[in-house]
C-alpha cells in the first residue's frame, strides 16, 4: 500500500523527458498547493475541479546542476537539523535552534520529523505562535517534540491508520497514506517527503500539528455550536460511541444547520428511536478523511450503511455535492470533525414520499392533491411505483380527477418491496385492490407495461422505485384483445380453424406475435384453404407465433438479440433497437400489448418456423 | 493520427435545437478534455464549455450554460453539442478541439460545422 | 471571468519584417497562454501553448513570451501565409476565454 512512492514513480514518468530525476507536479493556479501528478489528475488537469498546470521540479532528493539538463545531481545529505535547510523549511530550523533541539537533531539518534514549511507556520493563529516564542524552552520544546518520532519513517513506513507516540508525551500521531498518494499526519499533508539524514528523515508538512487529547465526544460536548447535535446525539445514544477508540470521521451540523430543518421533520426523526440512529450514523464514516485527501468525488460508508459522496470545489470540501463544510480537520484522539450548515438525512430515515427525487415531482404533486398523501401513514409500510415525470401526457393530466386517482392507486403497494425482494412472477396488490405482475429480465425489472430505471430507494416506511410509464393493469385476456381488434381477424380465425382458441383464453404467461390482417393480403384464397385444410401444418405456423413467458420489448437489453423457443418447438429471435422490437429481424408493428395472460406484439408478416 | 470529424451543417428554425457532433479517432478518447467553440460570421473565437469524457464532468461558460449542452459517448468515442431555444444570434461555426496533456491548449481541432438558424 | 485583451485589432507589416502581437489578461493566469492563427475559411491552427512552447510544425519563426498578465506573439521573417487572423486564449482558470483576434 506504498501509494506515496507509486504517485510519485508516475510524476517521475511524467517529467522524465524534462531531464533525469524530473518530478511533474501539478499546481492550481493562484495558489501555492503542489500535488505528485496521479494518472487520473495528469489526464483531467484539474484537482477539486480547480484547472492545474504542470510544474517540472526535481524529484526528492536530486538538485539541478549548472548547464545540465534535469536534476543529474543528488542532495548532500546532513544531520536532521541541517536537512531542515536544505528542504527550506527554515523557520522549523530556527525554532530548533531557539527551543534547545538542534544539539539533540545534531547527535546520536534516529528521528523523524515533520516539519512545518515556512508558510505552515505564517498560517498559525498569532495568538498561539506568540505565545510559542514567548516560552521556547518549554512550549515550543514540546510543539516540536510532538512533531518528531524517535526512529527513522520513511513514507512507506507510514502505513495508513497507524497512531505513532510523538516525542513529547506519547501523543500519538494519526497517519493517513491514502490511495491518490496524499500521506497525513493529524491532517498536516506531507508535501515535501523523504529527505534522507544521517540521523533520520525530514518530511514538511503544510500546516502546524495542535496538540490533541480529547476525543470526538469530548469536542462535541464542550462545543456550544454543536448543542442541537449533542441533544440529537443522547437521544439516540450515539454519543457515547464517538468516545471509544477509532478513527471516525464526523460531519458534525451545527445548530444552524439543525434551524434549516423543518419543525416537523426533525421531530418525527427525533420520536423515532430507529429513523433517528439512523440520522446520527449517516454522519460518521469509519476511516479518517482528512481535508487533504480529498482530491475529487469519492464515495464512502457511513454507519448507517449508506454510502455519501465527499468531494471538494477549490478549498472547499463538498458533500453529496454541495459546499457545506464551514471548519475542516478539528482532529482529535479518536478521529476528525468537519462542521457543517446543513444536516445530512439519509433515505432509511424519509418518510416514502420524501425519497421521490426531481424526475418524480409530477407524481408526488399528483399524490397531494389527490389526497392520496394523507394515505401513506408514517405506521404503514408501502411502496411507491413512481413515474418519471414525461411519462404524465397532458391527456392523462386533465383526466378526470377521479379516473386519475384510479390510475395512482395502481402505483402504490399496500406493503414496503424492496428491489432486491422482486421476482418473475410475483402477484404485488395496490391500495386499490389492483393486482399487478412483476417480470424480471437479465437487465430488467418490469410491473405489468412498464420497465423500472436506476434509482429505486427504501425509506422509513416504504421504498420507492421508478418508472419509466404510467403503468397500466391489462384488463382482458389474449382472446379477448384479439377479437376486439379487427386488424387481427385473420389471424383468429386461423387460430380458431387450428383448435388453438382455448389457449388463449386460459390464465397463463404468454408472448403473441399476432400478423395484422395485411400480412395475409398477398395470399391467394387457395393458399388460406391449404393452410385451414392441413389442420397439423396450421397448427405448426400458429404455435410458432406463441412463446411461454411474458417478453417485453422494453425489457430487453437494447442492441442484443434475444433467442426464445416457441411452443412450436422452433426458436425465434427478438431485438430491441432504437424502441423498435425485431421480430425475426422484421419491425413490429406495435409492441407489448398487455393482456390479462401474457402480451401481444404485432407483425405484418405471417412468420414461418426455419 | 488524431483526427475530430464534425458532422454536417445544420440549418433550423428559432426555437429549435439541433445536436452537433463530433467524433475522435487516433487517440484515447476518454483520456481528454474536448472543447467547443464558437465564431460568429467575421467575427472572433468564443469558448462555449467542455466536456471530459473520462467521467462526463463539464465545464461552461455563464453566458451559454442553459443553451448548450455537453455529451460524451465513449462506446462511439464522439462528442455531442445540444443547443437549445435556437435564435439568430447562434447562427455560428461550431469547432471541437481536443485539449491535450501537461500544458498544452487545444492541439487538434475539427473542421467546423456551419448552424444557421433562420425562419 | 477573466478577459484577454488584444488591443490592436488590425496590424500592418511586410513579408521579411517582425512583428509582435500582444494580448494582456485581466488577472493573473500564469503561463497558460496559447496562440492561434486562422486562416479565412479553416479551422484554428495552434502555434504556441504554455506562453512560450511551440506547437509541433510550428516553424521557428513564430515565439511566443510572457507570464502572469503580459502576453506577446512574435513572428520574425514574416511570410505571406502569415497574413491573416491570430487569437490568444487563457486556459490557466474555467471559462476559458479568447482575445478579441488581431488581423
Known amino acids: 500500500n506504498n501509494h506515496y512512492d507509486k504517485i510519485l514513480a508516475h510524476s517521475r514518468i511524467r517529467g522524465r523527458d524534462q531531464g533525469p530525476n524530473v518530478c511533474a507536479l501539478q499546481q492550481i493556479l493562484g495558489t501555492k498547493k503542489k500535488y505528485f501528478s496521479t494518472c487520473k489528475n495528469w489526464y483531467k488537469k484539474s484537482i477539486c475541479g480547480q484547472k492545474t498546470t504542470v510544474l517540472y521540479e526535481c524529484c526528492p532528493g536530486y538538485m539541478r546542476m549548472e548547464g545540465m539538463k534535469g536534476c543529474p545531481a543528488v542532495l548532500p545529505i546532513d544531520h536532521v537539523y541541517g536537512t531542515l535547510g536544505i528542504v527550506g523549511a527554515t523557520t522549523t530550523q530556527r525554532y530548533s535552534d531557539a527551543s534547545k533541539l538542534r544539539e539533540e537533531i545534531e547527535g546520536k539518534g534516529s528521528f523523524t520529523y515533520f516539519a512545518p514549511s515556512n508558510e505552515a507556520w505564517d498560517n498559525l493563529d498569532s495568538d498561539i505562535r506568540r505565545g510559542l516564542e514567548s516560552n521556547v524552552n518549554v512550549e515550543l520544546l514540546n510543539a516540536l517534540h510532538s512533531h518528531m518520532i524517535n526512529k527513522r519513517m520513511l513514507t512507506k513506513d507510514l502505513k495508513n491508520g497507524m497512531i505513532i507516540p510523538s516525542m513529547y508525551n506519547n501523543l500519538g500521531l494519526f497517519i493517513n497514506h491514502y490511495p491518490n498518494g496524499v500521506v497525513t499526519v493529524n491532517c498536516a499533508r506531507i508535501i515535501h517527503g523523504n529527505q534522507i539524514a544521517t540521523n533520520g528523515v525530514v518530511h514538511v508538512i503544510d500546516r502546524v500539528l495542535t496538540q490533541i487529547g480529547t476525543s470526538i465526544q469530548d469536542f462535541i460536548e464542550a462545543e456550544d455550536d454543536l448543542s442541537s447535535f449533542r441533544a440529537a446525539a443522547i437521544t439516540s445514544d450515539i454519543l457515547e460511541a464517538l468516545g471509544r477508540d477509532g478513527h471516525f470521521t464526523l460531519f458534525a451540523p451545527t445548530n444552524e444547520a439543525f434551524e434549516k430543518l423543518p419543525r416537523g421533520v426533525l421531530e418525527r426523526i427525533m420520536g423515532d428511536k430507529v429513523a433517528s440512529e439512523a440520522l446520527m450514523k449517516y454522519h460518521i464514516l469509519n476511516t479518517l478523511q482528512c481535508s487533504e485527501s480529498i482530491m475529487g468525488g469519492a464515495v464512502f460508508e457511513t454507519l448507517e450503511g449508506n454510502t455519501i459522496e465527499i468531494g471538494c470545489d477549490g478549498d472547499s470540501i463538498t458533500v453529496n455535492g454541495i459546499k457545506m463544510v464551514n471548519k475542516k480537520d478539528i482532529v482529535t484522539n479518536n478521529g476528525v470533525i468537519h462542521l457543517i450548515d446543513q444536516v445530512l438525512i439519509p433515505d432509511s430515515a424519509k418518510q416514502v414520499i420524501e425519497l421521490a427525487g426531481k424526475q418524480q415531482t409530477t407524481f408526488t404533486d399528483l399524490v397531494a392533491q389527490l389526497g392520496l398523501a394523507s394515505a401513506l401513514r408514517p405506521d404503514g409500510e408501502y411502496t411507491l411505483l413512481a413515474p418519471v415525470n414525461n411519462a404524465f401526457s397532458d391527456d392523462t393530466l386533465s383526466m378526470d380527477q377521479r379516473l386519475l386517482k384510479l390510475i395512482l392507486q395502481n402505483h402504490i403497494l399496500k406493503v414496503k418491496v424492496g428491489l432486491n425482494e422482486l421476482y418473475n412472477g410475483q402477484i404485488l396488490e395496490t391500495i386499490g385492490g389492483k393486482q399487478l405482475r412483476v417480470f424480471v429480465y437479465r437487465t430488467a425489472v418490469c410491473i405489468e407495461n412498464s420497465c423500472m430505471e436506476k434509482g429505486s430507494k427504501q425509506g422509513r416506511n416504504g421504498a420507492i422505485h421508478i418508472f419509466r410509464e404510467i403503468i397500466k393493469p391489462a384488463e382482458k385476456s389474449l382472446h379477448e384483445k384479439l377479437k376486439q381488434d379487427k386488424r387481427f381477424s385473420t389471424f383468429l380465425s386461423l387460430l380458431e380453424a387450428a383448435d388453438l382458441k382455448e389457449l388463449l383464453t386460459q390464465p397463463g404467461d404468454w408472448t403473441l406475435f399476432v400478423p395484422t390482417n395485411d400480412a395475409f393480403k398477398g395470399m391467394t384464397s387457395e393458399e388460406k384453404e391449404i393452410l385451414i385444410r392441413d389442420k397439423n401444418a396450421l397448427q405448426n405456423i400458429i404455435l410458432y407465433h406463441l412463446t411461454p413467458g411474458v417478453f417485453i420489448g422494453k425489457g430487453f437489453e437494447p442492441g442484443v438479440t434475444n433467442i426464445l423457443k416457441t411452443t412450436q418447438g422452433s426458436k425465434i429471435f427478438l431485438k430491441e433497437v432504437n424502441d423498435t422490437l425485431l421480430v425475426n429481424e422484421l419491425k413490429s408493428k406495435e409492441s407489448d400489448i398487455m393482456t390479462t395472460n401474457g402480451v401481444i406484439h404485432v407483425v405484418d408478416k405471417l412468420l414461418y418456423p426455419a | 493520427q488524431v483526427q475530430l470529424q464534425q458532422s454536417g451543417a445544420e440549418l433550423a428554425r428559432p426555437g429549435a435545437s439541433v445536436k452537433l457532433s463530433c467524433k475522435a479517432s487516433?487517440?484515447?478518447?476518454?483520456?481528454?478534455?474536448m472543447q467547443w467553440v464558437k465564431q460568429r460570421p467575421g467575427q472572433g473565437l468564443e469558448w462555449i464549455g467542455a466536456i471530459y469524457p473520462g467521467d462526463g464532468d463539464t465545464r461552461y461558460t455563464q453566458r451559454l450554460k442553459g443553451k448548450a449542452t455537453l455529451t460524451a459517448d465513449k462506446s462511439s468515442s464522439t462528442a455531442y453539442m445540444e443547443l437549445s431555444s435556437l435564435a439568430s444570434e447562434d447562427s455560428a461555426v461550431y469547432y471541437c478541439a481536443r485539449e491535450g496533456e501537461g500544458n498544452s491548449a487545444m492541439d487538434y481541432w475539427g473542421q467546423g460545422t456551419s448552424v444557421t438558424v433562420s425562419s | 471571468d477573466i478577459v484577454m485583451t488584444q488591443s490592436q485589432k488590425f496590424m500592418s507589416t511586410s513579408v521579411g519584417d517582425r512583428v509582435s502581437v500582444t494580448c494582456k489578461a485581466s488577472q493573473n493566469v500564469g503561463s497558460s497562454v496559447a496562440w492561434f492563427q486562422q486562416k479565412p475559411g479553416q479551422s484554428p491552427k495552434t502555434l504556441i501553448y504554455?506562453?512560450?512552447y511551440r506547437d509541433s510544425g510550428v516553424p521557428d519563426r513564430f515565439t511566443g513570451s510572457g507570464s502572469g498578465t503580459d502576453f506577446t506573439l512574435t513572428i520574425t521573417n514574416v511570410q505571406s501565409e502569415d497574413l491573416t487572423d491570430y487569437f490568444c486564449?487563457?486556459?490557466?482558470?474555467?471559462?476559458?476565454?479568447f482575445g478579441g483576434g488581431t488581423r
Open positions: 487516433g487517440y484515447s478518447f476518454t483520456h481528454y478534455w
Open positions: 504554455s506562453a512560450s
Open positions: 486564449l487563457q486556459y490557466g482558470t474555467y471559462p476559458y476565454t
